[in-house]
Amino acid sequence: IPVIEPSGPELVVKPGETVTLRCVGNGSVEWDGPISPHWTLYSDGPSSVLTTNNATFQNTRTYRCTEPGDPLGGSAAIHLYVKDPARPWNVLAKEVVVFEDQDALLPCLLTDPVLEAGVSLVRLRGRPLLRHTNYSFSPWHGFIIHRAKFIQGQDYQCSALMGGRKVMSISIRLKVQKVIPGPPALTLVPAELVRIRGEAAQIVCSASNIDVDFDVFLQHNTTKLAIPQRSDFHDNRYQKVLTLSLGQVDFQHAGNYSCVASNVQGKHSTSMFFQVVESAYLDLSSEQNLIQEVTVGEGLNLKVMVEAYPGLQGFNWTYLGPFSDHQPEPKLANATTKDTYRHTFTLSLPRLKPSEAGRYSFLARNPGGWRALTFELTLRYPPEVSVIWTSINGSGTLLCAASGYPQPNVTWLQCAGHTDRCDEAQVLQVWVDPHPEVLSQEPFQKVTVQSLLTAETLEHNQTYECRAHNSVGSGSWAFIPISAGARTHPPDE
């Protein structure tokens, strides 16, 4: 590590005196920074000597010496004060530039350490500092404004008390630059707009930025619009607002509107679409099929999408029958707005009962008139089966009635022994009825079909089973001939 003679760390001299600073190291040494013309610099073996024959207040500063060959990069420093009774300050720079929230060093160096107790920092012409200016002072370096703010970018003077009066330095201009994180923030409202020809409309493009240097414009398709700009300062940001007001819109006003703002960091834009229509409109649609089938006991949500302008004046869900005069509970109806002109209406039908099958209609109204969208809801049921023994035209006949939805198909089975249900191993014979007779087929109701099995003689040690099946499930009924007639029963649950 190099060594400076005199040993310091401070040296106080009077103006006009000769000052010699010698730096000695193991190898070659050099003085840091630009050396002013007032100094003479010469080398003497492993030492470097700075000398001046006429010290002035401008020589006040810290002198640092380094040894370039030293792997530890050591240095030595001495601070020289040239105490001039007329010049308490040596200002090293007249302008300082920092970014906001950085510490700003105002390099006014005190020429006499004795004056330290009476120093202060003021704005130009002795004005007090801005409120909450947090600063500290170092006689070697000057005043530090901590975490400088944009509005603290001012002209400052360093003040020292000498013989009961304040002596000011020349001024130092501090420029505090805002840290611009990116392009200005933008809003364009509304996000979309629909108007009937002849109505009024307003589109507002606003941009905000951390500093005042930014531009904003509103453009229609590819045309830049000439709109007066309103400026404001709010929440520590600069705002610029462009408002396009149209008294009576026409089709030429329709199209794409872009709000564009730019600053040193770049450009940011956002767009919206303005639609001009001839008259009010109201469109209802659904992503669902309007004919719905649901298994009894399950739930269903009916969803309708509405596109409308002007807004809806009324809407409701109605049950149109055919089973009862009940109406959907309002709590089961839900409305959500996707955006200004599009809405979704949902009717929740939980745990559907047989009496809730039928037609459900969503009705909506706006100045364009009424519109309705109707869903047809059919419930699916697993088949219910019953078998009876009857005589038709003198012939013994097994008559199987199956009821369900969708329409059940019917299969007869004959199996050995008496059983509630034929299993595969016992089956002796299978008859599939390709065309059972439809007894009833009303909308939204179960379909009832009938199948006949004609048997001249029924074998007593056999079971005859009617099975019905549809997409929901299956049902069956077993018939066991007995000597005293016949008995029928459904299988055990």
Epitope: R127, L130, N134, F233
Partner: antibody
Framework: QVQLQQSGAELMKPGASVKISCKAT????????IEWVKQRPGHGLEWIGE????????NYNEKFKGKATFTADTSSNTAYMQLNSLTSEDSAVYYC?????????????WGQGTSVTVSS | DIVLTQSPASLAVSLGQRATISCRTS??????????MHWYQQKPGQPPKLLIY???NLESGVPARFSGSGSETDFTLNIHPVEEEDAATYFC?????????FGGGTKLEIK
């Protein structure tokens, strides 16, 4: 929500000292200055000074140096102002108010005020 | 210290009309386009309530009938249309340098 709750009214003898408290809730106490303001009928509003609870930094109006002393307890989010050597001139309503760090900012929330009456 | 002079000291305004209060400062309180002037409303027995900050910015929750304008040394508070509940004393305050100072107040009466 931000609230500043001040201690109750005080009736004091001349020459005595009084300590007024201001309890802050609803914001980060250490990050905002607590301002103290005096109001006397016919004298308007006068700024006494301020304290930044996080650092203990204080600034006093020259006029009130030696009269007022500010302290703050960050564990209880409470700021205090002590007024000493009371005279009839100190009879007033004293307010605490919150102020963010920087010239840009106003005193956005105020306590309800503490009335101090100095009478023999 | 910066001196703030408010005028008038009192005024009476009819319901629904405009009230205009002026505040003049002994030094400029504007810096880099920011005006360090704030307005407060005070009703009897209550603390001051912030209405406008940085000359023209409406504090959250304050009705839009209050507005502020001005720069450098001349500032104005406008209330339009005046409502019954606006009867109060209004103060301006500068925050550019210590000590912060207040205007003497303007008492608004509703006719």
């Amino acid at each position: 929500q931000v609230q500043l709750q001040q201690s109750g009214a005080e009736l004091m003898k001349p020459g005595a000292s009084v300590k007024i408290s201001c309890k802050a809730t609803g914001y980060t106490f250490s990050s905002y200055w607590i301002e103290w303001v005096k109001q006397r009928p016919g004298h308007g509003l006068e700024w006494i000074g301020e304290i930044l609870p996080g650092s203990g930094s204080t600034n006093y109006n020259e006029k009130f140096k030696g009269k007022a002393t500010f302290t703050a307890d960050t564990s209880s989010n409470t700021a205090y102002m002590q007024l000493n050597s009371l005279t009839s001139e100190d009879s007033a309503v004293y307010y605490c108010a919150r102020n963010y760090d920087g010239s840009l900012y106003p005193m956005d929330y105020w306590g309800q005020g503490t009335s101090v009456t100095v009478s023999s | 210290d910066i001196v703030l002079t408010q005028s008038p000291a009192s005024l009476a305004v009819s319901l629904g009309q405009r009230a205009t209060i002026s505040c003049r400062t002994s030094e400029s309180v504007s810096i880099h386009g920011t005006h360090l002037m704030h307005w407060y409303q005070q009703k009897p027995g209550q603390p001051p309530k912030l209405l406008i900050y940085a000359a023209s910015n409406l504090e959250s929750g304050v009705p839009a009938r209050f507005s502020g304008s001005g720069s450098e040394t001349d500032f104005t508070l406008n209330i339009h249309p005046v409502e019954e509940e606006d009867a109060a004393t209004y103060f301006c305050q500068q925050s550019i340098e210590d000590p912060p100072t207040f205007g003497g107040g303007t008492k608004l009466e509703i006719k």
